[in-house]
């Protein structure tokens, strides 16, 4: 997260880190005791999933292996359309005050809605600085029409934009797959943005979760 702040401890109990060995690979969101939602471009053969801690690499955090993941069938590596994936944990999470599932959206929030995005991604760009603490940024949803003025054909129909006018605050490498939460519901998954990160008036781009609720529910049901 560029130009963000340290999240209030324990305020994001649904936030997970997808690790490749001991290294951060992507963020993710707990949606069920067996399931984590993340970005399709985060796909690996297997994952180590850290839950229940704001500190990356926390020895006291829950760590669960995951060997199965299900990309949206319409995902494109080139355009990042349908950049959403479900990761099935090999064993169920122990729920607690530190580990909770996020609320999936009942509706799509409108432009102007205040939201928070979180992650352990680099806080500087192009030079990288990876924080140990979970970082947050407060952003507002931007209409598709406004966002298309910036990204033109790069922006797909189920992509959601968020940012703050003239501000550098944004997501960056390592934040991918993490949650954009608005009014206590998951509205977005970090997908992409301009590199180097933090270009003013280039919004962060997210997968719009409200458009995928049926796919999420059906995929979890099929593979339970």
């Amino acid at each position: 997260i560029i130009d963000g702040y340290k999240c209030k401890e324990g305020s994001h109990p649904w936030q997970v880190a997808l690790l490749k060995g001991n290294q951060l690979h992507c963020g993710g969101v707990l949606v069920d005791k067996y399931w984590v939602l993340t970005a399709a471009h985060c796909k690996m053969g297997q994952y180590q999933v850290q839950l229940g801690s704001d500190k990356i690499g926390d020895q006291s955090a829950q760590k669960i292996k995951a060997t199965k993941s299900f990309r949206h069938p319409g995902y494109s590596t080139k355009t990042h359309v349908n950049d959403i994936m479900l990761v099935r944990l090999d064993e169920p999470v122990k729920m607690s005050s530190k580990v909770e599932a996020v609320q999936l959206p009942e509706h799509c929030e409108p432009p102007g809605t205040s939201c928070t995005v979180s992650g352990w991604g680099t806080t500087t760009s192009p030079d990288v600085t990876f924080p140990s603490d979970l970082m947050c940024s407060d952003v507002k949803l931007i209409s598709s029409r406004e966002c298309k003025k910036v990204y033109k054909d790069l922006l797909g129909k189920t992509m959601l934009c968020a940012g703050i006018p003239d501000s550098k605050t944004n997501t960056c490498n390592g934040d991918s797959g993490g949650p954009l939460v608005c009014n206590d519901t998951l509205q977005g998954l970090v997908s992409w943005g301009t590199y180097p990160c933090g270009q003013p008036n280039d919004p962060g781009v997210y997968t719009q979760v409200c458009k995928y609720k049926r796919w999420v529910m059906e995929t979890m049901k099929t593979h339970r």
């Epitope: 471009h41 990288v128 990204y151 790069l154 992409w192 590199y195 180097p196």
Partner: antibody, heavy 122, light 107 residues
């Protein structure tokens, strides 16, 4: 189809400033998610990235050339420019302007100009 | 800066041969690796992006693989029109850096 065209003098005297302009057609220089780059190739040699500029005006330069390079953009003309000061014979090269997809997820040069040979000689 | 070491610097092969070029990065670049083809007197052309993705319109005989520090570029069946110099390029960090190039000739 995006097209890029370099223009500027083909001969520059040592210690002077090399100035090149790239005119972009078929796409807007003010589009987000792209960088506008200068890349050079010494005769018979490999490719060297000089630097890039974004629609915001942010610039990034190769540290090896940073003290001598300035890249600027004129969105009204859909052009961006390169200035390289205090040139020597070692700056003789084919200079390319290029557009790169510049995203957190992937970054690559997808469109190149045809290149223009600049010779530094008195 | 990330150094890119490409090998071989040149090779000669027959039409129909399988050609392999390797590229090694001085540090982990994940899959931020692109391959370009440059014909004499022309600008480079993108063939492969993100280590293994074929650019639209590029023939399927070209392929790429690898992740981290070691990458491979393959032409499955060399054609006369493939005579060119091939460059790898890392896009993990600025400054973007290129390999030294591999000149491919027909025997």
């Amino acid at each position: 189809q995006v097209q890029l065209q370099e223009s500027g003098p083909g001969l520059v005297k040592p210690s002077q400033t090399l100035s090149l302009t790239c005119t972009v057609s078929g796409g807007s220089i003010s589009s987000g998610g792209y960088s506008w780059n200068w890349i050079r190739q010494h005769p018979g040699k490999g490719l060297e990235w000089i630097g890039s500029i974004y629609r915001s005006g942010s610039t990034y330069y190769n540290p090896s050339l940073k003290s001598r390079v300035t890249i600027s953009v004129d969105t009204s003309k859909n052009q961006f420019s390169l200035k390289l000061s205090s040139v020597t014979a070692a700056d003789t090269a084919v200079y390319y302007c290029a557009r790169a997809k510049a995203l957190t997820t992937h970054r690559y040069v997808d469109y190149w100009g045809q290149g223009t040979l600049v010779t530094v000689s008195s | 800066d990330i150094q890119m070491t490409q090998s071989p610097s040149s090779l000669s092969a027959s039409v129909g041969d399988r050609v392999t070029i390797t590229c090694q990065a001085s540090q982990d670049i994940a899959n931020y690796l692109n391959w370009y083809q440059q014909k004499p007197g022309k600008a480079p052309k993108l063939l492969i992006y993100d280590a293994s993705n074929l650019e639209t319109g590029v023939p399927s005989r070209f392929s790429g693989s690898g992740s981290g520090t070691d990458f491979t570029f393959t032409i499955s069946s060399l054609q006369p029109e493939d005579i060119a110099t091939y460059y790898c390029q890392q896009a993990r960090d600025l400054p973007f850096t290129f390999g030294g190039g591999t000149k491919v000739e027909i025997k």
